[in-house]
């Protein structure tokens, strides 16, 4: 007992201040299990990682609430965190079925590229950045962003890394990323599309 | 409990088509992918292809277009795989398997059904 | 398609003893991989995803480690249930599987 509390608590101590805040929100339309009952949103948006942690046990007991912070996480496009969170809860444990993950709203945009529609996905699931990198170098990558993205450290931060770079591009630009992928991970896009 | 029952066993000529139904209870339905997987005897797991419940948008292994089709019935939480023109190649066992999330990951499978098995012969 | 070589067959083992079971991808597939036991007559179970988590109520001697294009599946301390067939599989891109390695008894 006591570690799936210490796995979220060390889970949302790692979230930035805004990536709390975006937490806390989703935490209020997250679907739950039938039988629990959602935090109230007055108490929850003004709690730091701490008390955060202990509502969320209280609430949903140490393995439904690790479960729910690691599907939460994952809707927020935070991959290796929510696969840590997972498994350090599961060292040993006899975890609980996995929940429901409800479907994100993804329909497509208008106006807004493949890219920019799914990013959250492609930070999670692109597995051979350097694929990509070795397709854009030259075109729309300087050699300094080809090695600013290489030197990070796991893919999720190589394709955050990518991605910072991304609001200086045009379409035509974005469609090179696109069709990279497509030779790349080609199942990957085919799924997104249809999502 | 998540349950994936599907139909039992096909006994078919070369040359027809034949539908497995896969019926799912336990979950909603519309929450998760359905994959469906061939075993030959003996032989390795091949991925034959998925399907969203939600808008019907299927994704094929290259190998099984035109082979294969996925649909879903989501009013009875039924996936169905129709193969045809069969030959004795098509001769296997056929899992119905439920992507375990989608969206932020790929497919893998955390529940499968017990099977179905299709023998062609004339 | 991403090819999963599992080079051992077959592999003789004891009761107690410490196994680890191999599989290579084709090219590099970051850790979207999963292992999944098949026991005679039965449907695969799933053991471990993203290469190392392991799945809900699996026993803590399965283990999975690996990235990029090596993966290995490890039983600490093996049992006579878990004789069975192994399955690697790769889901970075479309689905494929190894050609599974089976567990028997020396």
């Known amino acids: 007992m006591g570690r799936a509390r210490d796995a979220i608590l060390d889970a949302l101590e790692n979230l930035t201040a805004e990536e709390l805040k975006k937490f806390k929100l989703k935490l209020l339309s997250v679907p739950l299990r039938e039988g629990y009952g959602r935090i109230p949103r007055g108490a929850l948006l003004s709690m730091d990682a701490l008390d955060l942690t202990d509502k969320l046990v209280s609430f949903y007991l140490e393995t439904y609430g690790a479960e729910l912070t690691a599907n939460v996480l994952r809707d927020m496009g935070l991959q290796e965190m929510a696969g840590q969170l997972q498994a350090a809860t599961h060292q040993g444990s006899g975890a609980a079925p996995a929940g429901i993950q409800a479907p994100p709203q993804s329909a497509a945009k208008p106006g807004l590229h493949f890219i920019d529609q799914h990013r959250a996905a492609l930070i999670a699931r692109v597995t051979n950045v350097e694929w990509l990198l070795d397709a854009l170098y030259g075109k729309v990558l300087t050699d300094e962003q080809y090695q600013a993205v290489r030197a990070e450290p796991t893919n999720p931060s190589k394709m955050r890394k990518l991605f910072s770079f991304t609001p200086a591009w045009n379409w035509t630009c974005k469609d090179l990323l696109l069709q990279a992928l497509r030779e790349s991970q080609s199942y990957l896009v085919e799924d997104l599309e249809r999502s | 409990e998540v349950q994936l029952q599907e139909s039992g066993p096909e006994l078919v000529k070369p040359g027809s088509s034949v539908k497995i139904s896969c019926k799912a209870s336990g979950y909603t339905f519309a929450d998760h992918y359905m994959n469906w997987v061939k075993q030959s005897h003996g032989k390795s797991l091949e991925w034959i292809g998925d399907?969203?419940?939600?808008?019907?948008?299927?994704v094929y292994n290259q190998k099984f277009k035109g082979k294969a089709t996925l649909t879903v019935d989501k009013s009875s939480s039924t996936a169905y795989m129709e193969l045809r023109s069969l030959t004795s190649e098509d001769s296997a066992v056929y899992f119905c398997?439920?992507?375990?999330?989608?969206?932020?990951?790929?497919?893998?499978?955390?529940?499968w059904g017990q099977g179905t098995t299709l023998t062609v012969s004339s | 398609d991403i090819v999963m070589t599992q080079s051992q067959k077959f592999m003789s083992t004891s009761v107690g003893d410490r196994v680890s079971l191999t599989c290579k991808a084709s090219?590099?597939?970051?850790?979207?991989v999963a292992w999944y036991q098949q026991k005679p007559g039965q449907s695969p179970k799933l053991l471990i995803y993203?290469?190392?988590i392991r799945y809900t109520g699996v026993p803590d001697r399965f283990t999975g480690s690996g990235s990029g294009t090596d993966f290995t599946l490890t039983i600490s301390n093996m049992q006579s249930e878990d004789l069975a067939d192994y399955f690697c599989?790769?889901?970075?891109?479309?689905?494929?599987f190894g050609a599974g390695t089976k567990l028997e008894l020396k």
């Open positions: 599989q790769q889901y970075s891109n479309y689905p494929t």
């Open positions: 399907i969203n419940p939600n808008n019907g948008g299927s």
């Open positions: 090219q590099i597939v970051g850790t979207a």
């Open positions: 993203s290469a190392s």
């Open positions: 398997a439920r992507r375990r999330a989608h969206y932020y990951d790929g497919p893998y499978f955390d529940y």
